[in-house]
């Protein structure tokens, strides 16, 4: 662990109450193939415990979705991954809209610091799938 | 190699016979930019040779595809990556549908064990592109 | 740095003149969350300084885009990442079309050599978003 190989792969636990766009995550071998090795969960949000550059990746699939589900909505459903606390470091890291599709997936490299909490905000009125092969979120420490 | 840096990037060889949804992969410098360094191919399917957490990634593009070719299907074309053997460890790791699009691409972290064979199942009646910059599949060992 | 942990994450600077499909990138902490640690920029194009296998990733979002923007174009908007110099090593590594969507995102493992310059060509008449959470391009050295 001293090498700094912090890594986590999370599965969706639940969505927030109506005015809270955040997705709430869970992880651990008892739940399936999700795990936390270094980072930790704080009320369903991922908190970083080691400074460094991380590869952040996410896939979110909308539940019982067809291309008409997403295209008929006036305000497109959007997923944003960002640092939500501490407030001084708040920033959007990754943003995608679903448009005619039902799944978004992306990844990026970004510097993160100990104590950064990552939030994944799903705006719109469609629900994310809780299937563990359709919706997941992870980070991997790659270098100091 | 003793560091456990197992890694592979594969290109599409061919699809299976009609009732076999699996994609068959190939790799090696003679074929282009694909390679196998640690993992191996067993009849076109990728077999893991070292325990650990892996980053699995895939991109599949449908052949001569326009948005009309996929939207007219009421059975959407779907790509699933999973462990298909040993049977005791069979599970779907990653699943995406094409919906109105012609390409899916995603990645995830997952624990894999020596002997796990990964299958990539493309269900539907569209062919995957064999262009090496449009369709590829790879794994990267990232930590024990 | 002697470990060979070359890594870069870039944000879009600008597009080229009309007959130049290349995207021009920039990186550095002063610009936001982009950085170059090993690779370098040559007139907005990313140049590799260390041989090895790299994970290349990209996300490009089209500016002020809706699914009708992309679907109404006869020639689909396409993004290709490739080695553009030296000419002897020129090859397309990664290619995606937008079709009905407004964002493409993918990643792949590929061998790169010192001196390889990577170009990202966006063909079509739609402009990429310059928002740093919507359009980015990066590489990560993963093994020799």
């Amino acid at each position: 662990e001293s090498l700094g190989w912090d890594i986590a792969e999370l599965q969706l636990n639940h969505t927030g109450p109506q005015q809270d766009p955040r997705l709430y995550w869970q992880g651990g071998p008892a739940l399936g193939r999700s795990f936390l090795r270094g980072p930790e969960l704080d009320k369903g949000q991922l908190r970083i415990r080691r400074d460094g550059i991380y590869m952040v990746h996410i896939q979110v699939t909308l539940a019982i979705c067809s291309s008409t589900s997403t295209s008929r909505h006036h305000h497109p459903t959007t997923l944003a991954v960002g640092i939500c606390s501490p407030a001084s470091r708040s920033i959007s890291l990754l943003r995608l809209s679903f448009h005619q599709g039902c799944t978004i997936a992306s990844q990026r490299l970004t510097p993160l610091a100990r104590g950064d909490t990552l939030c994944t905000n799903l705006t719109g009125t469609l629900l994310p799938s809780r299937n563990t092969d359709e919706t997941f979120f992870g980070v991997q420490w790659v270098r100091p | 190699e003793s560091l456990g840096w197992d890694i592979a990037e594969l290109q599409l060889n061919h699809t299976g016979p009609q009732q076999d949804p699996r994609l068959y992969w190939q790799g090696g410098p003679a074929l282009g930019r694909s390679f196998l360094r640690g993992p191996e191919l067993d009849k076109g399917q990728l077999r893991i040779r070292r325990d650990g957490i892996y980053m699995v990634h895939i991109q599949v593009t449908l052949a001569i595809c326009s948005s009309t070719s996929t939207s007219r299907h009421h059975h959407p074309t779907t790509l699933a990556v999973g462990i298909c053997s040993p049977a005791s460890r069979s599970i779907s790791l990653l699943r995406l549908s094409f919906h109105q699009g012609c390409t899916i691409a995603s990645q995830r972290l997952t624990p894999l064990a020596r002997g796990d064979t990964l299958c990539t199942n493309l269900t539907g009646t569209l062919l995957p592109s064999r262009n090496t910059d449009e369709t590829f599949f790879g794994v990267q060992w990232v930590r024990p | 740095e002697s470990l060979g942990w070359d890594i870069a994450e870039l944000q879009l600077n600008h597009t080229g003149p009309q007959q130049d499909p290349r995207l021009y990138w920039q990186g550095g902490p002063a610009l936001g969350r982009s950085f170059l640690r090993g690779p370098e920029l040559d007139k907005g194009q990313l140049r590799i300084r260390r041989d090895g296998i790299y994970m290349v990733h990209i996300q490009v979002t089209l500016a002020i885009c809706s699914s009708t923007s992309t679907s109404r174009h006869h020639h689909p908007t396409t993004l290709a990442v490739g080695i553009c110099s030296p000419a002897s090593r020129s090859i397309s590594l990664l290619r995606l079309s937008f079709h009905q969507g407004c964002t493409i995102a993918s990643q792949r493992l590929t061998p790169l050599a010192r001196g390889d310059t990577l170009c990202t060509n966006l063909t079509g008449t739609l402009l990429p978003s310059r928002n740093t959470d919507e359009t980015f391009f990066g590489v990560q050295w993963v093994r020799p």
Epitope: - | L12, A63, I64, R72, T125, L127, N131 | -
Partner: antibody, heavy 120, light 111 residues
């Protein structure tokens, strides 16, 4: 066994219209696109267009836009082609055809053809 | 539209010999790693029958004496050894884009 059974021959006057049918059996009708192909006597084959019975999605060869109209009736697993404003150039055998396993425009199963003769 | 030109227009081949039919496309019909050319056999007063798809794949139930080859713009259908029942007109067809088009046909006669 897949079968495409086409309606019988038609003798029609110039300027009139004709509607021919193609009844499918041996498979799920809404799963497969139906294509239509024209063959003039002693000549080659010309693609007219296709219809997907699931959602009535159609595509036409530019040459046949305004000439051919493709429709279907899911309840009877039947595809139809109507030809309008007929001239002697429309005298031909018209085939319906089903794609093969893969959803691209090559044709694994064919009807027996409907002969249309346009004559005053 | 892509134009397919077949040659020869007709040929006569002795029983047991090889028949070679050519098809040339006005532009490449290769894309996505496949060659989008297909071959059909048509006998008088019958519908066409698919023999070969994607340039070289034998359709189920078609005898192995039929084979297809080629890429880009030049394609060949070979029949060897030719049998009596192979007397027919043969057509190539592309599905690279819409509209699919057919070659003009090659009439094979058995000597």
């Amino acid at each position: 066994e897949v079968q495409l059974q086409q309606s019988g021959p038609e003798l029609v006057k110039p300027g009139a219209s004709v509607k021919m049918s193609c009844k499918a059996s041996g498979y799920t009708f809404t799963d497969y696109v139906i294509h239509w192909v024209k063959q003039k006597p002693g000549q080659g084959l010309e693609w007219i267009g296709y219809l997907h019975p699931y959602n009535d999605d159609t595509k036409y060869n530019e040459k046949f836009k305004g000439k051919a109209t493709l429709t279907s009736d899911k309840s009877s697993s039947t595809a139809y082609m109507e030809l309008s404003s007929l001239t002697s150039e429309d005298s031909a055998v018209y085939y319906c055809a089903r794609r093969g396993y893969y959803d691209y425009a090559w044709f694994a199963d064919w009807g027996q053809g409907t002969l249309v003769t346009v004559s005053a | 539209d892509i134009v397919l030109t077949q040659s020869p227009a007709s040929l006569a081949v002795s029983l047991g010999q090889r028949a070679t039919i050519s098809c040339r496309a006005s532009k490449s019909v290769s894309a996505s790693g496949y060659t989008w050319i297909h071959w059909y056999q048509q006998k008088p007063r019958q519908a066409p029958k698919l023999l070969i798809y994607l340039a070289s794949n034998l359709e189920s139930g078609v005898p192995a004496r039929f084979s297809g080859s080629g890429s880009g713009t030049d394609f060949t259908l070979n029949i060897h050894p030719v049998e009596e029942e192979d007397a027919a007109t043969y057509y190539c067809q592309h599905s690279r884009e819409l509209p699919p088009t057919f070659g003009g046909g090659t009439k094979l006669e058995i000597k």
